[in-house]
Amino acid sequence: NDNKPIFKESLYRLTVSESAPTGTSIGTIMAYDNDIGENAEMDYSIEEDDSQTFDIITNHETQEGIVILKKKVDFEHQNHYGIRAKVKNHHVPEQLMKYHTEASTTFIKIQVEDVDEPPVF
């Protein structure tokens, strides 16, 4: 396990509707690892999200990171967000830790989609 996972893209762009409930999956991110088997298994996490609005869970079957809405968003309040995600191997033997100190990161631009209120009669 001397290869660390690296994101395919330095920037991901996702959109979320302001009507989306918490827990909604708003998109996926993906890293690649040149190792095989369990040495290629990875874990995604949030490195930076000052708004604490999003979370990332790992799909261990596809090795994708799934970006999840943790708090409802409001277009009028904030119509875009930026979060930084990181990825690390799930299994790293002690003797190979030196190869894995710097986790690969990516930036995610998230655009909030406006949902017009229906007119009140």
């Epitope: 330095s10 920037l11 762009r13 959109t15 000052d50 708004s51 009028e76 309040h77 904030q78 119509n79 875009h80 930026g82 930036f107 655009q111 989609e113």
Partner: antibody, heavy 119, light 107 residues
Framework: QVQLVESGGGVVQPGGSLRLSCAAS????????MHWVRQAPGKGLEWVAV????????YYADSVKGRFTISRDTSKNTLYLQMNSLRAEDTAVYYC????????????WGQGTLVSVSS | EIVLTQSPGTLSLSPGERATLSCRAS???????LAWYQQRPGQAPRLLIY???SRATGIPDRFSGSGSGTDFTLTISSLEPEDFAVYYC????????FGQGTKVEIK
């Protein structure tokens, strides 16, 4: 090097229409969100509209909503602003600007094109 | 809409002096999503600072930005002749709005 060149400005009567163009070069146009910003004579900057990198999302300032339309043609590396129902208060220099890749600030601007709405 | 108020309106200084420009937001600007631009007469604006404190490519280190929440500052440590211009702050926390500008003029 990155270059943005606006054209299409001119004098138009109130209620008239005009289409501005912004020719982009020196970067991968299809990877960047693009904006229009205007500046009335002797005044400050006012954001007008944005279009996403792939053209699927557009947003407008309230002052132009329903009258202006932003669009882009990736095959021509060109950004457009269709302005209808023009008013005297739309008189300004119109700049196109590129949004930073990892941010939402504007890292490159064109030289601007002047639109005068007058009878 | 987040309203940005810049002060002072005009700053009269001599080359070599330190300039301190202020930008106050009507509500908190998330994630320090604030930029500063310089506009010389007859020219387009130029990005100086983004993220409240990060210098844009090619910007001299005499320009620095600081602040968070609702109060932000642009400092020019020692004014050069080419620095006399109008400076705008911009927030991009929610949509995009600009301050009304501060003119830095030669005393």
């Amino acid at each position: 090097q990155v270059q943005l060149v606006e054209s299409g400005g001119g004098v138009v009567q109130p209620g008239g229409s005009l289409r501005l163009s912004c020719a982009a070069s020196g970067f991968t146009f299809s990877s960047y969100d693009m904006h229009w910003v205007r500046q009335a004579p002797g005044k400050g900057l006012e954001w007008v509209a944005v279009i996403s990198y792939d053209g699927t999302n557009e947003y407008y300032a309230d002052s132009v909503k329903g009258r202006f339309t932003i669009s882009r043609d990736t095959s021509k590396n060109t950004l457009y602003l269709q302005m209808n129902s023009l008013r005297a208060e739309d008189t300004a220099v119109y700049y196109c600007a590129r949004e930073r890749y990892f941010d939402w600030s504007f890292d490159y601007w064109g030289q601007g094109t002047l639109v005068s709405v007058s009878s | 809409e987040i309203v940005l108020t810049q002060s002072p309106g005009t700053l009269s200084l001599s080359p070599g002096e330190r300039a301190t420009l202020s930008c106050r937001a009507s509500q908190s600007v998330s994630n320090t999503y604030l930029a500063w631009y310089q506009q010389r007469p007859g020219q387009a604006p130029r990005l100086l600072i983004y993220g409240a404190s990060s210098r844009a490519t090619g910007i001299p280190d005499r320009f620095s930005g600081s602040g968070s929440g609702t109060d932000f500052t642009l400092t020019i440590s020692s004014l050069e002749p080419e620095d006399f211009a109008v400076y705008y702050c911009q927030q991009y926390s929610n949509s995009w709005t600009f301050g009304q500008g501060t003119k830095v003029e030669i005393k």
